[in-house]
């Protein structure tokens, strides 16, 4: 008789999760000389220790502290790019602009990007069938708590001018419930961060509206200003041209507004 197993509303752990985490760690530490000292087996042990045998609705930031210790990494604090609901373009940008970093360009972000994981209370099993959904089941699940923890630390590390890429095609360009809106915005340190500069990415080719005037952007400006951080906003009307101009800034067409 098969043992009863909790059915959650979200997808189960990504197949070959342990192997994927270990392989990504090895790859990352090979590419980034400053992280060569990292012992990837210990990284996996720490990752595993954070959620294995724990109820997947009762995970805390404390559970991830050993992993956070092992993944401690110094990125230039004035070269941080945050993003919300526009991950692919943000990653394309930092692949070209190599001196800027998204969270997923750090070891811990790279390890977990696009993966799902959870365990079961009091067993050593990884649950490949289902994991808790943030809305339908619980917010203190292994994946959500991980991203909350690393996002908080990433925002806390930022300084000078911090950039954020926002999706202008969404009904809420700035969403208070996103990781950016609920975690990162509130963990920028006013004593270190001078300005938050939002880049609003337009979707339609003929969209010439000033999305920096959007009510949700005004809401973001208000939140940031109350935290004694300056706010600025730019429209990126042509994301394709924007990326092209990052690659080839000398191109004559790159002097006009993009």
């Amino acid at each position: 008789v098969p043992r009863w197993r909790q059915q959650w509303s979200g997808p189960g752990t990504t197949k070959r999760f342990p192997e994927t985490v270990l392989a990504r760690c090895v790859k990352y530490t090979e590419i980034h000389p400053e992280m060569r000292h990292v012992d990837c087996q210990s990284v996996w042990d720490a990752f595993k220790g954070a959620f294995i045998s724990k109820h997947p609705c009762n995970i805390t930031e404390e559970d991830y502290q050993p992993l956070m210790k092992l993944g401690t990494q110094t990125v230039p604090c004035n070269k941080i790019l945050l993003w919300s609901r526009i991950k692919d373009l943000a990653h394309q940008f930092t692949q070209v602009q190599r001196d800027m970093f998204t969270l997923e360009d750090t070891l811990l972000g790279y390890l977990a990007d696009d993966l799902t994981w959870c365990g079961e209370f009091n067993t050593s099993k990884i649950n490949y069938q289902s994991c808790p959904d943030w809305r339908k089941d619980c917010s203190n699940n292994p994946v959500s708590v991980f991203w909350k923890t690393v996002s908080r630390r990433f925002a806390e590390a930022a300084c000078d001018v911090v950039h954020v890429m926002l999706n202008g095609s969404r009904s809420k360009i700035f969403d208070k419930n996103s990781t950016f809106g609920s975690v990162e915005v509130h963990n920028l340190q006013p004593e270190k961060v001078q300005t938050l500069e939002a880049w609003v990415i337009h979707g339609g080719r003929e969209d010439s509206r000033d999305l920096c005037q959007d009510p949700t952007i005004k809401e973001l400006e208000s939140i940031i200003s109350k935290r004694n951080i300056q706010f600025s906003c730019k429209n990126i009307y042509r994301p394709d041209k924007f990326l092209q101009c990052v690659k080839n800034p000398e191109d004559s067409s790159c002097t006009s507004e993009i």
């Epitope: 012992d39 220790g49 294995i52 045998s53 210790k69 050593s124």
Partner: antibody
């Protein structure tokens, strides 16, 4: 193999304090949990606590609070354990050992004899 | 504190035999258990962690099994160099605790 080299044997008087060192020979020192373990003659192993040199975080076995103090020097890759108010009960071999999910590398041990 | 009980202080075996060394935790530690070998006059050596993962360089005749509260270290095809004390340890809860040890004697 990651050798951990501990300071030599100590003969110490009751009531005195003592500092034992444990030097790591690899660059992973800052990113390892450094444990200290006691083994009294003919007895088992007792975990004293650990230090994580990367951020100087420590965790102690309540039994050794006030008795042992763990510190680390990142620049030299050395962990230290200070033992205070020593009594004959503290006579033992003290090991440093690296690791958090099982202690994968151990020092050779430091023998401490407390006697007047 | 979690108590790790090794019921046999001594076990006697012959070269080539298979021996099981047992360890019982006073509460569920899932698989957060390590096994160590300590030869006379030496430091302990890690054999097994996560209850069943063999540490680098450990011969495959050493096998760990169990979960929850009951754990076993199995040595198959015992060799004369296996004469040692064997300790289990839990790292599920603080403080970490060790079993009292099982001395393996070779007949």
């Amino acid at each position: 193999q990651v050798p951990l080299h501990q300071s030599g044997p100590e003969l110490i008087k009751p009531g005195a304090s003592l500092k034992i060192s444990c030097k790591a020979s690899d660059s992973a020192f800052n990113n390892s949990w450094m444990n200290w373990v006691r083994q009294r003659p003919g007895k088992g192993l007792e975990w004293i606590g650990w230090i994580y040199p990367g951020d100087d975080d420590t965790k102690y076995n309540g039994k050794f609070m006030g008795k042992a103090t763990l510190t680390a020097d990142k620049s030299s890759g050395t962990a230290y354990m200070q033992l205070s108010s020593l009594t004959s009960e503290d006579s033992a071999v003290y090991f440093c050992a690296r690791g958090r999910w099982g202690m994968d590398y151990w020092g050779q041990g430091t023998s401490v004899t407390v006697s007047s | 504190d979690i108590v790790m009980t090794q019921f046999h202080n001594f076990m006697s075996t012959s070269v080539g035999d298979r021996v099981n060394i047992n360890c019982k935790a006073s509460q569920n530690v899932v698989t957060a258990v390590a096994w160590y070998q300590q030869k006379p006059g030496q430091s302990p050596k890690l054999l097994i962690y996560w209850a069943s993962t063999r540490h680098t360089g450990v011969p495959d005749r050493f096998t760990g099994s169990g979960s929850g509260t009951d754990f076993t270290l199995t040595i198959s095809n015992v060799q004369s160099e296996d004469l040692a004390d064997y300790f289990c340890q839990q790292y599920s809860n603080y403080p970490f605790t060790f079993g009292s040890g099982t001395k393996l004697e070779i007949k």
